[in-house]
């Protein structure tokens, strides 16, 4: 499958899990914290302010990078995965923490974590998809 | 208490490599980002380059055809190698780490000055 | 390369006064990407803020980051004898990593 079509597929059933996160776990437009969101590289469930959230590097990445094996489990409620089966310093694991001005940088940058670089430059304009 | 501590020869001649290791000591630490930065006299700080954990490096422009950096297989050290240093490498190199999941370096070593003549 | 201009070069106050300096970046940095340090002679530099608003552990409460996109702010509220050293801003979002040229706080 062309990696674009991946990219379309995992969008469309990132936006279906954090519609069903939200629904478990009573958030709202007005809800404080950060929205559930696709970064147009792996999925971010929605989370509370102070809350740092792990995930592994997506499926996608061993297109790009087939020799390194991640774990395919992200941290958070029901279709998100299993929170203990991810550790900080585990390779192949980016982070964001929700703060009260909304989700933090990932860390470390993608391109570290999982062995493809997400953008030309950094700094680069990002068109994330929030669903709250 | 966890320290960094940079050493190598504090004299180097024009031409030659300037070679340094950052050692942790006091505990072990897991870092994420290595990085070495460098300060000549009375000048600002300038960013050399930083090594993942990984081993993926990234170096600064104006620097990158000369330095070259590596971990050491226990972890707790890392090495910078400047090649056909000149007078203007003369500076002080400190060796600064992330090790929290966080944008920042929270530790940073005391540095040591590097002089580079003949 | 994204470059970071910090003014005043020098600022000269007394103690007790409150300190207001800046770095202008070249293009937009995220905040998650901008900290400050803090310099004294003869010394490595030591982190103050991280996240352009976020203090370090042990960082007395005088000291506050704020601002966004392309201009910041690093604000000491009432200058102690033990503040007046160079302070340093820095970006992580873009490769090289890039420092401000420093601004100095000397004593009045």
């Known amino acids: 499958m062309h990696s674009d079509c991946i990219f379309k597929k995992e969008q469309a059933m990132c936006l279906e899990k954090i519609q069903r996160a939200n629904e478990l776990m009573g958030f709202n437009d007005s809800s404080p914290g950060c929205p559930g969101m696709w970064d147009n590289i792996t999925c971010w469930k929605p989370a509370h302010v102070g809350e740092m959230v792990l995930v592994s590097c997506p499926e996608l990445f061993r297109i790009f990078n087939p020799d390194q094996v991640w774990e395919t489990e992200t941290i958070g409620e029901s279709d998100f995965g299993d929170s203990n089966s991810l550790d900080l310093s585990d390779m192949g694991v980016v982070s964001r923490n929700c703060t009260e001005d909304g989700w933090s940088e990932p860390f470390p940058h993608y391109f570290d974590a999982c062995g493809f670089d997400e953008y030309e430059s950094e700094t680069g304009d990002q068109d994330y998809y929030y669903l709250s | 208490q966890v320290q960094l501590q940079e050493s190598g020869p504090g004299l180097v001649k024009p031409s030659e490599t300037l070679s340094l290791t950052c050692t942790v000591s006091?505990?072990?630490?897991?870092?994420?980002?290595w990085s070495w930065i460098r300060q000549p006299a009375g000048k600002g700080l300038e960013w050399i380059g930083r090594?993942?954990?990984?081993?993926?490096?990234n170096y600064n422009p104006s620097l990158k055809s000369r330095v070259t950096m590596s971990i050491g297989t226990s972890k707790n050290q890392f090495s910078l190698k400047l090649s056909s240093v000149t007078a203007a490498d003369t500076a002080v190199y400190y060796c600064?780490?992330?090790?929290?999941?966080?944008?920042?370096?929270?530790?940073w070593g005391r540095g040591t000055l590097v002089t580079v003549s003949s | 390369e994204i470059v970071l201009t910090q003014s005043p070069g020098t600022l000269s106050l007394s103690p007790g006064e409150r300190a207001t300096l800046s770095c202008r970046a070249s293009?937009?940095?995220?905040?998650?990407?901008l900290a400050w340090y803090q310099q004294k002679p003869g010394q490595a530099p030591r982190l103050l803020i991280y996240?352009?608003?976020s203090r370090a552990t042990g960082i007395p409460d005088r000291f506050s980051g704020s601002g966004s996109g392309t201009d910041f702010t690093l604000t000491i509220s009432r200058l102690e004898p033990e503040d007046f050293a160079v302070f340093y801003c820095?970006?992580?979002?873009?490769?090289?990593?890039?420092f401000g040229q420093g601004t100095k706080v000397e004593i009045k």
């Open positions: 996240g352009a608003s």
């Open positions: 006091g505990g072990s630490i897991s870092s994420y980002y």
């Open positions: 090594i993942y954990t990984s081993g993926s490096t």
């Open positions: 293009q937009t940095v995220s905040r998650s990407y």
């Open positions: 820095q970006q992580f979002g873009s490769s090289p990593w890039t």
């Open positions: 600064a780490i992330i090790a929290s999941r966080g944008w920042y370096f929270d530790l």
